[in-house]
């Protein structure tokens, strides 16, 4: 059979039928259903939701839906011994205590099992000492404190505001600075947008609201006790002392009412500049310690959380491909939430549910995709991307041979201004072409394409008339597929206007106030942005699974490789004397990029001309496209980060959420002027240039004519 016969209807009609079947009202209904009680990883409630989703996906028409369980390290507060922070006087009496829970939102007062705010995987401890305010606790903040201000954090408890970077990086930085405890808080400057009311009257964070979250530094390892291998029934588990990525000092999050009480007494050094000041009515003094009258008072942390090996459940649904069943396109998003998960993750899970329903409807009418589509509802994402990583570890041999693409589906919205896409360059053209075919949901863009509104509101900084598409970083379930396995990946959601809203993420992120009502009242009453995200995510999956030639353009990789080579060369050139002394040349890298560009161009020409009716040649060309992302994987991984194996992209060593290009070279160059052995440091730069140049050249050769 020809590929079109096998899939029954013409490709264009298939896509239209699939998109037309997606309904905003269904997404709304699913979101409501998924958000009425908490679904914390490792709990009975989340297991029940897994079984419900399994049952519904079967009803929707998938060929099979299975639960995949793992026993992984999770972290919970002690129910009888709550976590809190005190100010103590010289006699050790507690004269102020932070709140033990968030005031529940209206209508949820009687809901049980709302986990109080905590920093997951914090060790137990009751450190006491002077406070030091460390701004966002970024690498550059500690440089400012230690190098410029000569403030020593050793033996101090540091207080840092949330935002800018992943919280785990903050904790790592504090540990390296010698701190004995970390207090994380949400400053209104970052989590309270001007002119908007706090929940329940608006979408801003109230003073008693607190952001939960894990504070691990896993670097892609998955379950801390079984790095590299699935946490199955016969797993060998490391001892807790050898576990990957656990913090070594107590950590606890608080809201801005409680933060005010701690920060208002701060003495010591004034903030170095205005970028260290938030919006509270406090001086933002750095410390150490409290001012004058309060100088004998100290801060004490009381942390009693426990780490426990707990069973988690992924739901894996399969829609078998008609022509290439051994080629997998994966749509995955997590199911576990910190509390109700109104945005994170259920706004994404509801969209996945509707996408599954639409695919199932087409399948019931006799259609099948060309390639197999796998749908995943991941567990324990909030505890370190554990469900997705364990499943990928268990199935790594299949995935590395058969994985075409992974599309992530966490929160569908973090605002309602415009589209946001992060993906491999291989998917740029797919995203452009798809968004040109979709209608914009934005006010003022009636009858215009999504591409047009997106490009207008979020223009590319490099190419006029094109929208911004960002690098993939981490902090979500695509990590193992892209950074470890080299499977082409992408993600899409609706976002805020970054120009006018400088707060980090969305204000109610990971708080008890992330409810169904938050979405329905304030973010997307008509669920039109959710529907658009469903069309983008679903449309990408459809095209990846159904187009005869994979919708990847290798020429777009060539363009970004040149851009990234220029960027890293320019960073290195900040040290011209050392480059000359140590004979550092980027010639091999530029040469490899030039070769890649030429070979990619020739491959694209052959792709236009080859005989698509010859299934062997078609499969050969598609395999070259599928395996291109894989060719950027270095089996040895990045220095000290063995599970980050992609040579072109990795999560930033200073912020897990951000992507860094040529990360090996970048890290070798970072702060190189402070290295004690410059010869060794510049030797490592040269080694990383060699690795990058070799990898780009090797990837280019996978696109050459095979014989």
């Amino acid at each position: 059979k020809s590929s079109n016969e096998a899939t029954n209807i013409t490709p264009k009609h298939n896509m239209k039928a699939f998109l037309d079947e997606l309904k905003a009202e269904n997404i709304k209904k699913f979101l409501y259903n998924f958000t009425q009680i908490p679904h914390l990883a490792g709990t009975e409630q989340n297991f029940q939701l897994a079984k419900q989703i399994q049952s519904q996906w079967k009803e929707f028409g998938l060929d099979s839906v299975e639960l995949a369980h793992y026993d992984v390290l999770l972290s919970y507060p002690n129910k009888t011994h709550p976590n809190y922070i005190s100010i103590i006087n010289e006699d050790g009496n507690e004269i102020f205590n932070t709140s033990l829970f968030e005031p529940p939102p209206p209508g949820y007062e009687n809901v049980s099992d709302i986990v109080p705010p905590f920093s997951a995987f914090s060790p137990q401890g009751m450190p006491e000492g002077d406070l030091v305010y460390v701004n966002y606790a970024r690498t550059e903040d500690f440089f400012k404190l230690e190098r410029d201000m000569k403030i020593n954090c050793s033996g101090k408890i540091v207080i840092a505001r949330y935002g800018k970077v992943f919280r785990g990086n903050k904790v790592k930085n504090a540990q390296l600075a010698g701190a004995k405890g970390v207090i994380l808080y949400s400053d209104p400057a970052d989590y309270f947008a001007p002119g908007v009311k706090s929940y329940p009257d608006g979408w801003n964070l109230p003073g008693g609201g607190v952001q939960r979250g894990n504070i691990l530094n896993l670097n892609g390892a998955g379950d801390p006790l079984t790095p590299g291998y699935p946490a199955n029934e016969y797993a060998y588990r490391r001892g807790i002392a050898e576990a990957v990525g656990l913090p070594s000092i107590p950590v606890h999050p608080i809201g801005y009412y409680d933060a005010q009480k701690l920060l208002e007494k701060m003495g010591g050094s004034a903030p170095p500049d205005s970028s260290w000041r938030g919006s509270l009515k406090v001086p933002y003094n750095v410390g150490p310690g409290f001012t004058g009258n309060f100088s004998t008072q100290k801060v004490k942390m009381h942390i009693h959380s426990t780490n426990e090996v707990t069973r988690i459940y992924n739901v894996i649904g399969t829609l078998r491909g008609a022509v290439e069943p051994d080629r997998y396109v994966i749509l995955g998003g997590h199911r576990d939430s910190w509390v109700f998960g109104g945005i994170d993750p259920q706004s994404g899970a509801a969209v996945v549910h509707e996408i599954v329903r639409s695919f199932g409807t087409l399948k019931k009418e006799g259609w099948r995709p060309r390639r197999t589509i796998l749908f995943a509802s991941w567990d324990a994402e909030e505890f370190g991307l554990l469900g997705s990583t364990e499943w990928a570890e268990e199935n790594s041999r299949l995935l590395q041979e058969r994985g075409v693409a992974y599309i992530n589906a966490d929160s569908s919205i973090e605002g309602n201004y415009t589209l946001r896409v992060d993906c491999t360059p291989l998917m740029y053209s797919l995203v452009h072409n798809l968004t040109k075919e979709l209608k914009s949901p934005d006010e003022g863009f009636e009858g215009k394409s999504l591409y047009e509104s997106w490009t207008k509101k979020s223009p590319s900084p490099e190419f006029s008339g094109m929208p911004r598409i960002s690098k993939l970083g981490s902090g979500n379930d695509f990590e193992v597929f892209f950074q470890r396995l080299g499977i082409a990946s992408g993600r899409a959601r609706y976002t805020k206007n970054w120009e006018t809203n400088k707060f980090s993420g969305y204000p109610l992120y990971h708080s008890v106030y992330e409810t169904y009502e938050l979405v329905e009242k304030f973010y997307d009453p008509m669920f039109k942005y959710h529907l658009t995200v469903a069309q983008v995510r679903g449309g990408m999956v459809f095209e990846l699974a159904n187009s005869i030639v994979l919708p990847f353009d290798c020429r777009d990789y060539a363009v970004v490789l040149r851009k990234y080579a220029d960027k890293i060369y320019s960073i290195s050139m900040k040290h011209p004397q050392e480059m000359k002394t140590y004979s550092v040349s980027f010639d091999s890298l530029f040469s490899a990029v030039k070769n890649f560009t030429e070979i990619a161009s020739k491959f694209s020409e052959r792709l236009q001309d080859f005989d698509k009716s010859n299934p062997i040649v078609l499969r050969m060309m598609n395999d070259q496209l599928m395996f291109l992302e894989r060719a950027f994987i270095d089996p040895l991984g990045l220095p000290d980060r063995p599970f980050y194996r992609h040579v072109i992209y990795a999560p930033s060593s200073h912020n897990k959420y951000a992507g860094e290009s040529f990360p090996g070279i970048y890290d070798a160059l970072f702060d190189i002027e402070s290295k004690v052995d410059p010869s060794k440091a510049w030797g490592e730069v040269k080694r990383q240039i060699y690795v990058a140049a070799f990898t780009v050249q090797a990837a280019a050769e996978t696109l050459s004519e095979v014989a």
Partner: nanobody
Amino acid sequence: QLQLQESGPGLVKPSETLSLTCTVSGGSISSSSYYWGWIRQPPGKGLEWIGSIDYSGYTYYNPSLKSRVTISVDTSKNQFSLKLSSVTAADTAVYNCARHKAATADFDYRGQGTLVTVSS
């Protein structure tokens, strides 16, 4: 023998744009083996690379100056130019144009330099 010569005003007012031109003689600017760059040395400080350009007009800029720098090339005149906008006193320095091997920091020829003072 290759020679490079900087030209341009020695005094620039704060917030204005510094403009310098480098004329290359004794050799062609149109070589793919070399980049043409600008470097500077503020009084009492180390050498700082500003940016470079190749004969085709492809530019590389110091990330910390990128938003303010423009380097352009005119192969017909065997010249390349530097523009640095929104200058402050911190931009006071001796500015040199130089040639370096492509993809390296091997500066083999440079002009004698011109002092540019930023002051009102």
